[in-house]
């Protein structure tokens, strides 16, 4: 004989649990139906009557199968420095995200942003790191040898120094290298290629801790067929 299907409410077998989308009501001591997302329990079950569900009212929601007597209130409207990425519906809460140039300083448990803050700016000698701080703010990193940043920005990364046949002024962490104009009388002489390295710098990012000190400039003699090695070290 096929197993009988129990209709809610029903008393569970000793040691067994209620089925999916059911809950055990400790007062009725029965397995009863949960309400679907977008609804809430209007009337709890009894030993003989199942849960009665009702739709969530405007500006309230339930995201999961539930037996709550009241739907949850949607969060307040997004503030002027935020954008609404998910609207409040009967089945989901409103989600607010920070507009460009800001990060979320205080998140709600549902993932919406409660408070946005302006992104920190990295000062000359420091670029924006590829990873973010745990709170979503910009992380600044000192420009690695061979790279520089001459801006105060929340988006600019360290850029490679220009490569000169003849170097006029070496670059450092906060300035680019300056190349000398090529002299035609020197064209037959084996060239010394300059890979400009930053000089020690005391610059530090705005709103950030100071970075490590920089290595001094290095002059590399490469002969007439130079091979350029670019540093991949992090700063």
């Amino acid at each position: 004989l096929p197993a009988q299907v129990a209709f809610t409410p029903y008393a569970p077998e000793p040691g067994s649990t209620c089925r999916l989308r059911e809950y055990y009501d400790q007062t009725a001591q029965m397995c009863c139906s949960k309400c679907s997302p977008g609804q809430h329990a209007k009337v709890f079950c009894t030993k003989t009557s199942d849960t009665v569900c009702d739709s969530c009212e405007d500006s309230t929601y339930t995201q999961l199968w539930n037996w709550v007597p009241e739907c949850l209130s949607c969060g307040s409207r997004c503030s002027s420095d935020q954008v609404e990425t998910q609207a409040c519906t009967r089945e989901q809460n409103r989600i607010c995200a920070c507009e460009a140039g800001r990060y979320c300083a205080l998140k709600t448990h549902s993932g919406s942003c409660r408070q946005c803050m302006r992104l920190s700016k990295c000062g000359p000698g420091f670029g924006v790191a590829s990873s973010r701080a745990p709170n979503g703010n910009v992380l600044c990193k000192a420009c690695a040898p061979g790279t520089f940043s001459d801006t105060t920005s929340s988006t600019d990364v360290c850029r490679p120094h220009r490569i000169c046949s003849i170097l006029a002024i070496p670059g450092n962490a906060s300035t680019d290298a300056v190349c000398a104009p090529e002299s035609p009388t020197l064209s037959a002489i084996p060239r010394t290629l300059y890979v400009s390295q930053p000089e020690p710098t005391r610059s530090q990012p705005l709103d950030q801790e100071p970075g490590p000190s920089q290595t001094p400039s290095i002059l590399t003699s490469l002969g007439s067929t130079p091979i350029i090695e670019q540093s991949t070290k992090g700063g």
Epitope: T27, K42, V43, T46, V52, P69
Partner: antibody, heavy 119, light 106 residues
Framework: QVTLKESGPTLVKPTQTLTLTCTFS??????????VGWIRQPPGKALEWLAH???????YYNPALKSRLTITKDTSKNQVVLTMTNMDPVDTATYYC???????????WGQGTTVTVSS | DIQMTQSPSSLSASVGDRVTITCKAS??????IAWYQQKPGKVPKLLIH???TLQPGVPSRFSGSGSGSDYTLTISSLQPEDVATYYC????????FGGGTKVEIK
């Protein structure tokens, strides 16, 4: 307007059975989610839940008093009756009936009736 | 059975004071708690249900909070008309009242 009113004897003797009636208006016990419960309060003491009956006749009793209590309803008369056997002087109290919502809390109470158990 | 331990059993505070009453359940009651106010010689009146939902007509100085087994009723600014005994009721598993808190004015 929802109202409830308790009625019954003000004095009962020890070992006797107490019968209390709750007559209500403004709602019906044939309406889904409606219920009526009984609560008592000895002089100067806390409230104590006794029993409850739902629109579908499902009944619940305080486990400590279950053997002595019976709750019934007469939907057509808008009445709920509580009987309590083997009364004792410690059962002297004000007895209240109250409406219960579908989500199980008491929202409207009767004025209460004082019952004294004494020989 | 669920026991409800209410504290303090009595308190005396000045008008305008913030008053806090707590109820601790012997197990998780999933926010199914209501608070009642009973003035001397009167019937209990529902103030709050489902932990924090204020009944219509109840002054906003009354608020409720809590989860799991610990719950609180707060009167943000005590008024002379708040002199009463306050009871919690758990309705997560059957029904149990707390022992009551008598609130007086200093």
């Amino acid at each position: 307007q929802v109202t409830l009113k308790e009625s019954g004897p003000t004095l009962v003797k020890p070992t006797q059975t107490l019968t209390l009636t709750c007559t209500f208006s403004g709602f019906s016990l044939s309406t889904l989610g409606m219920g009526v419960g009984w609560i008592r309060q000895p002089p100067g003491k806390a409230l104590e839940w006794l029993a409850h009956i739902w629109w579908d006749a499902d009944k619940y009793y305080n486990p400590a008093l279950k053997s002595r209590l019976t709750i019934t309803k007469d939907t057509s008369k808008n009445q709920v009756v509580l009987t309590m056997t083997n009364m004792d002087p410690v059962d002297t109290a004000t007895y209240y009936c109250a409406r219960m919502t579908g989500t199980r809390y008491f929202d409207v109470w009767g004025q209460g009736t004082t019952v004294t158990v004494s020989s | 059975d669920i026991q409800m331990t209410q504290s303090p059993s009595s308190l005396s505070a000045s008008v305008g004071d913030r008053v806090t009453i707590t109820c601790k359940a012997s197990q998780n009651i999933n926010k199914f708690i209501a608070w009642y106010q009973q003035k001397p010689g009167k019937v209990p009146k529902l103030l709050i249900h489902y932990t924090s939902t204020l009944q219509p007509g109840v002054p906003s100085r009354f608020s409720g909070s809590g989860s799991g087994s610990d719950y609180t009723l707060t009167i943000s600014s005590l008024q002379p008309e708040d002199v009463a005994t306050y009871y919690c009721l758990q309705y997560g598993v059957l029904w149990t009242f707390g022992g009551g808190t008598k609130v007086e004015i200093k």
